[in-house]
């Protein structure tokens, strides 16, 4: 069974001091990752017993193995069902605690009832505050039965449930009609899936005979031991104040387990700790009684004395539960109640015995669950005992179960059953996960789901370059931590596999499936330098840069230009995909914007250091285009242009710019400024005769505006070759501005 205990502190003078603690003794409990099992959950279950809403309860985790619920503000907060869930996968187990109000009208004589399939269960509700009304019994919150108030027997209302079956399990309550549900008596009925002393799918297997009030689990045949007892059959008492499957937990506080209710996995239910009884577990056992709820009687013989925590303490020369066995009868000594081995191992099992006459090698035998008897291969004889060593054949899963060591001499015989758990070494079901990669290292998460049994003691990561025949490199890592594979080759694929191990000899599992992980390419190290930039328009910027002159090949795939518009909080990134490029034209920028510009070399996804930044101010956008541009030849060397001013001007025009180009010519166009913005006409002089020209123009305010439509016109024929075009405004014939 899962080692899970729910403790309730029942010192109820102040609800604010009340707390529930759930403690797990499971390996790896509460780590919370897929591979190692989900965390402990502790909560109030309001599905059946609902209480008025109050402030939320506080959940505190103490490490991965313990969780505590506090923050109860009034007694009614405590009433109801609480549950703790722990364990992983198929072992996920819910432990339930039912809390009754000490001031309720009706109180249960016994809260938890564990019965066998087919038994008759009797639930007894004691009258605490009498009401002369009927009593309603409910099962899991639904109406079940009514008793007339006259039907109380000796101040108790009894509910008899004959021939109970597992579906009858659940929360039962007895409530006076029209009384508050918080005044009910709440019970928990646990019906084992088998008859008394049986377990298994068809109830065909025999329980081991649980001692000291332990209850045989109907699914796996294990004894769920009361708090304070341990061993395969609960044969061993823990030291006072200890609990848990291996007595590994300790009751908090100076008064030990007084005032604590212990709830364990079904079919045990809840009880006081060993040595305590009463509704609040605050009363010590009466003389002659011991164990959980003081349910056990000592009946010590041969001068044994009764200890309320552990039972009979035998005088020298006697042993046994009641000190009924003479030490002359052979006795198995210090046999572990549970042993764990890994599948396909061949362990050695020791069994020691004492007695008079002294046991010899042949008088000690080992019996497997299938009835096979093993004889010891050697024995070590010491003055006070003989230890027989058994070499076990290769273990198979069917060897899991109860083994028995038996000693027989003429003085009698003794046997000790112990549980052998054959565990399957873990095998990863998935490949490890790549978290991050660099040029020479891979960071890998080795935590993967696995088949077989935990806990995981070591994780080995095996890796080598893909398609390589070289030996695998191996690194042993902590199960809970990511691992960095270092000193790898850049831009190389590696095959990576996980191997998991569990404790013990032969605990190494098979290697998991491989995965391919590729290292990044080397980080680019060179820092570019911005060398120049110039504005090619209100929204266009030409940028040039250089790289330091260093020997060796250039490590890089290209450049990233970054433009930061601090006013708008926007970044523009321009990728230049050639590492040979040293210039770029940035278009579609926002006119009139102050940009911070830098450039970085990149390689794969890695960025190198940025150049020191430049600050660039783009000119504002110019005005709209002039309208209705028209050209008219005046002579063999003159053409007159006329136009209309642009509409919707954002401000006064500072000048016009005319572009002149020979139609079909290959040369650069000529730009001529018209410095009198009020004009709507100008004469372009110095043109060649009989030549076709193209004209367009634009206005300037702070920046140059949009171009107008293009117009064509030819000069008149038979003139001389002119020196080149010039412009003359209609009102400014005295000055030519080329």
């Amino acid at each position: 069974a899962v080692d899970l205990t729910l403790l309730a502190n029942l010192r109820l003078t102040d609800p604010q001091r009340f707390f529930l603690t759930c403690v797990s003794g499971e390996a790896g409990a509460g780590r919370g990752s897929d591979a190692w099992g989900p965390p402990l959950l502790l909560e109030k279950d309001d599905r059946i017993v609902r209480t008025p809403p109050g402030p939320p309860l506080r959940l505190a985790r103490n490490g991965s193995h313990q969780v505590t619920l506090r923050g109860f503000s009034k007694p009614s907060d405590l009433v109801g069902v609480f549950s703790c869930v722990g364990g992983a996968g198929a072992r996920r187990t819910r432990v339930i605690y039912v809390h009754n109000s000490p001031g309720a009208h009706l109180l249960p004589d016994k809260v938890t009832h564990t019965v066998n399939k087919g038994d008759t269960a009797v639930l007894s509700a004691r009258v605490h505050k009498e009401k002369q009304t009927d009593v309603i019994w409910k099962s899991n919150g639904s109406y079940f039965y009514t008793l007339d108030w006259h039907e109380a027997q000796d101040g108790r209302f009894l509910l008899q449930l004959p021939n109970v079956q597992p579906p009858s399990s659940g929360i039962y309550s007895a409530t006076y009609l029209e009384a508050s549900p918080l005044g009910s008596a709440f019970f928990r009925l646990i019906v084992r899936g088998c008859g008394a002393g049986r377990w298994g799918p068809g109830c065909t297997k025999e329980c081991p005979g649980c001692l000291h009030g332990g209850v045989c689990h109907d699914h796996d045949g294990e004894c769920v031991c009361p708090p304070g007892f341990t061993g395969t059959r609960c044969e061993q008492a823990c030291r006072e104040g200890r609990f848990g499957q291996s007595c590994q937990e300790q009751c908090p506080g100076i008064s030990g387990c007084r005032g604590l209710t212990f709830c364990l996995p079904d079919p045990y239910g809840c009880s006081c700790g060993s040595g305590w009884r009463g509704s609040q577990c605050q009363e010590a056992c009466a003389p002659g009684h011991f164990g959980a709820d003081c349910r056990l009687q000592c009946q010590c013989q041969n001068g044994g004395t009764c200890d309320r925590f552990s039972g009979c303490v035998c005088p020298s020369g006697w042993h046994g539960v009641h000190c009924e066995k003479s030490d002359r009868i052979p006795q198995i000594l210090n046999m572990a109640s549970e042993l764990e081995f890994n599948l396909e191992t061949m362990p050695r099992i020791n069994c020691a015995a004492a007695g008079n006459p002294f046991p010899v090698r042949g008088s000690i035998e080992l019996r497997k669950p299938d009835g096979t008897v093993l004889l010891s291969t050697k024995a070590i004889v010491e003055p006070e005992k003989t230890t027989a060593e058994f070499e076990v054949p290769r273990l198979v899963l069917a060897d899991s179960g109860f083994w028995e060591c038996r000693v027989s001499t003429s003085g009698g015989q003794d046997s000790r059953r112990f549980k052998v758990n054959v565990k399957v070494p873990p095998v990863p079901l998935a490949a490890p996960r790549l978290l991050t990669k660099q040029s020479r290292q891979l960071v890998v998460s080795p935590l993967v789901s696995f088949s077989g049994d935990g806990p995981i003691s070591t994780v080995r990561l095996h890796y080598r370059p893909q398609d390589s025949t070289m030996d695998w490199s191996t690194i042993v890592v902590d199960p809970s931590e990511n691992v960095t594979l270092m000193n790898l080759r850049p831009k190389t694929g590696y095959s990576v596999r996980v191997q998991l191990s569990r404790p013990g000899e032969g605990g190494e599992g098979a290697w998991g499936p491989p995965t391919l992980m590729t290292t990044d390419c080397p980080e680019p190290l060179l820092q570019p330098w911005l060398e120049g930039w110039h504005v090619e328009g209100t929204d266009r910027l030409r940028v040039s840069w250089s790289l330091p002159l260093v020997p060796g090949p250039l490590v890089g795939d290209g450049f990233l230009l970054r433009l930061w518009d601090g006013t708008r909080g926007q970044e523009r990134r321009e990728n230049v995909s050639s590492p040979q490029a040293r210039t770029a034209l940035l278009t579609g920028l926002t006119p009139g914007t102050h940009y911070q510009l830098d450039v970085q070399l990149y390689h794969c996804t890695l960025l190198g250091p940025a150049s020191p930044p430049a600050h660039v101010l783009l000119p504002p956008s110019g005005p709209p285009a002039p309208r209705h541009l028209h050209a008219q030849a005046l002579s063999d060397s003159e053409i007159q242009l006329t136009w209309k001013h642009p509409e919707a001007l954002p401000g006064p025009i500072s000048k016009y710019v005319v572009e002149v180009q020979v139609a079909g010519g290959a040369g650069d166009p000529l730009w001529i400024d018209v410095d009198r913005p009020e004009e709507t006409s100008t004469i372009i002089r110095g043109l060649n005769a009989s030549t076709r020209y193209l004209f367009r123009m634009r206005a300037s305010i702070q920046g140059l505006g949009d171009w107008s439509n293009t117009v064509e016109e030819s000069t008149l024929g038979n003139g001389l070759q002119a020196e080149g075009p010039v412009q003359e405004s209609r009102a400014a014939e005295e000055g030519l501005d080329q």
């Epitope: 330091p548 250091p609 930044p613």
Partner: antibody, heavy 119, light 107 residues
């Protein structure tokens, strides 16, 4: 062997001018960005100005902007710092330093030249 | 601008001892931090760049570590020639900035 040799320091009155030079040898000067860094007496290091390998890019600390001009002559393997409108707080040892190829670190430094601004 | 703060201002140790110098940035500088050594009357010398990379010719007793805002220069066993002033410098954000220096003196 990389060598940087500063010159041109000296005593100057407030408001005056000086031109510092830094002669470089032992490496391809035109392939590296260059810095001027200064250190006031008994104080720490302060970056002053930087210039790109071809000289197309220059940048200045706020404390000297508009007064100092960095330039270089790659044909002469020489770095310059023209300092105008000098103030008392400009008094320092001025170092020229080479920019490391992989970032804004300074891998080689000159021995420094002392500039004293005092009336 | 990113402020760089070095501590302690002065560190007094004996040859053979281990020296640990700290540098803290006013905001994260990733791993973009360098250390320089300056002896009296001399120019600074680059020791460590990008947090942990030793510059050419720097002995193995000098090592750097840290990331984000907190960085450490460690000299594993002090030699007589190591007593000097040490400066840190960031290159994460422009402009580059230096710490005010830590003076390492002989005890």
């Amino acid at each position: 062997e990389v060598q940087l040799l500063e010159s041109g320091g000296g005593l100057v009155q407030p408001g005056g001018s000086l031109r510092l030079s830094c002669a470089a040898s032992g490496f391809t000067f035109s392939g590296y960005g260059m810095y001027w860094v200064r250190q006031a007496p008994g104080k720490g290091l302060e970056w002053v100005s930087v210039i790109s390998p071809s000289g197309g890019y220059t940048h200045y600390a706020d404390s000297v902007k508009g007064r100092f001009t960095i330039s270089r002559d790659n044909s002469k393997n020489t770095l310059y710092l023209q300092m105008n409108s000098l103030r008392a707080e400009d008094t320092a040892v001025y170092y020229c330093a080479r920019a490391y190829s992989s970032g804004w670190y300074l891998d080689y430094w000159g021995q420094g030249t002392l500039v004293t601004v005092s009336s | 601008d990113i402020q760089m703060t070095q501590s302690p201002a002065t560190l007094s140790l004996s040859p053979g001892e281990r020296a640990t110098l700290s540098c803290r940035a006013s905001q994260s500088v990733s791993s973009y931090l360098a250390w320089y050594q300056q002896k009296p009357g001399q120019a600074p010398r680059l020791l460590i760049y990008d947090t942990s990379n030793r510059a050419t010719g720097i002995p193995a007793r000098f090592s750097g570590s840290g990331s984000g805002t907190d960085f450490t220069l460690t000299i594993s066993s002090l030699e007589p020639e190591d007593f000097a002033v040490y400066y840190c410098q960031q290159r994460s954000n422009w402009p580059i900035t230096f710490g005010q220096g830590t003076r390492l003196e002989i005890k």
